[in-house]
């Protein structure tokens, strides 16, 4: 049994890290493999993750990591029974993938302005809470080419856009994702999308 692609891990920097790897051939990950992880900390405990299949030869493991802080470092050992297949380490603060924003809502009754709001997925005492900025994707449900991204480079989880910038009488969808520049994070997954009908009417022009 051989590891084809070594485990790579990302952390939501709150309580969960996800590691993925590929084996040399078809593998029943949960039956054959275990990922053992341990915080490099005085008298810390050994934890074990039972991986799930991610395709025929791919495995994924969800590692619970309590109270992550910047200095945390974990040892990782991938075992097949008594055979050590791979040994590595993982520092969550250096491999951050934020949680997706939540509760995306579109308010259409704000005088010719669309107001989009969402919630920061982190509690206020988490290090990432004040570090997140966002990208909002808005697209026309019936026309995939009518899609745009708005960069929200401030921390407030809101976006205002003029309804007139979108086509009238069309259904639109929006979704939002987050990243933490100061942690050199990757983008989060997109939030679930929310749908609305753009009923904005062009003002009648008199000639």
């Amino acid at each position: 049994m051989k590891v084809l692609q070594e485990p790579t891990c990302v952390s939501d920097y709150i309580s969960l890290s996800t590691c993925e790897w590929k084996m040399g051939g078809p593998t029943n990950c949960s039956a054959e493999l275990r990922l053992v992880y341990q915080l490099v900390f005085l008298i810390s405990e050994t934890n074990m993750c039972v991986p799930e299949n991610n395709g025929a030869a791919g495995c994924v493991c969800h590692l619970f990591m309590e109270d992550m802080v910047g200095a945390d470092n974990y040892t990782l050992d991938l075992w097949a029974g008594q055979q050590l297949l791979w040994k590595g380490s993982f520092k969550p603060s250096e491999h951050v993938k934020p949680k997706a924003p939540e509760n995306l809502t579109v308010y259409t009754n704000v005088s010719e302005t669309l107001l989009l709001t969402w919630s920061n997925p982190y509690p206020p005492d988490n290090y990432l809470y004040e570090k997140l900025t966002y990208a909002v994707n808005i697209w026309n449900e019936n026309d995939p080419t009518d899609s745009r991204i708005y960069d929200v480079t401030y921390q407030e989880p809101t976006l205002r856009i003029a309804a007139s910038t979108l086509k009238s009488g069309v259904s639109y969808r929006a979704r939002v994702r987050a990243w933490a520049q100061s942690y050199n994070s990757t983008w989060s997954e997109w939030s679930p999308s929310t749908k609305w009908y753009n009923a904005y009417k062009e003002p009648f022009e008199k000639h």
Epitope: F41, L42, E66, D67, V69, G70, A71, D72, N73
Partner: nanobody, 119 residues
Framework: QVQLQESGGGSVQAGGSLRVSCAAS????????MAWFRQAPGKEREAVAS????????YYADSVKGRFTISLDNAKNTLYLQMNSLKPEDTAMYYC????????????WGKGTQVTVSS
């Protein structure tokens, strides 16, 4: 710089209890790890318990699990070790230690407090 000062050691009969304290002063950069070590005469220094100050998560050596409790009062900047059901083999000098970003918890040390358990 961080200064650590232990207190509360003393002599106690086997089966008794004792609480030792460690007052931290100076920088609060030690906030990654705090711990208690002990060293008995003629033996190597050993880790007894450690704590993650942010969450209060505690870890214990097998020899003291269920008998000793490590805790931290953040407001008082004081680390405690409550020792119950003491045994003669718990006799040692007890040291408080701390670190700012090292999981081995040994950047800063106190001078120690003596605990003697007689049978």
């Amino acid at each position: 710089q961080v200064q650590l000062q232990e207190s509360g050691g003393g002599s106690v009969q086997a089966g008794g209890s004792l609480r030792v304290s460690c007052a931290a002063s100076g920088s609060t950069s030690y906030r990654y790890c705090m711990a208690w070590f002990r060293q008995a005469p003629g033996k190597e220094r050993e880790a007894v318990a450690s704590i993650r100050p942010r969450s209060g998560r505690a870890y214990y050596a097998d020899s003291v699990k269920g008998r000793f409790t490590i805790s931290l009062d953040n407001a008082k900047n004081t680390l405690y070790l409550q020792m119950n059901s003491l045994k003669p083999e718990d006799t040692a000098m007890y040291y408080c230690a701390a670190s700012d970003n090292d999981g081995n918890c040994q950047d800063y040390w106190g001078k120690g407090t003596q605990v003697t358990v007689s049978s």
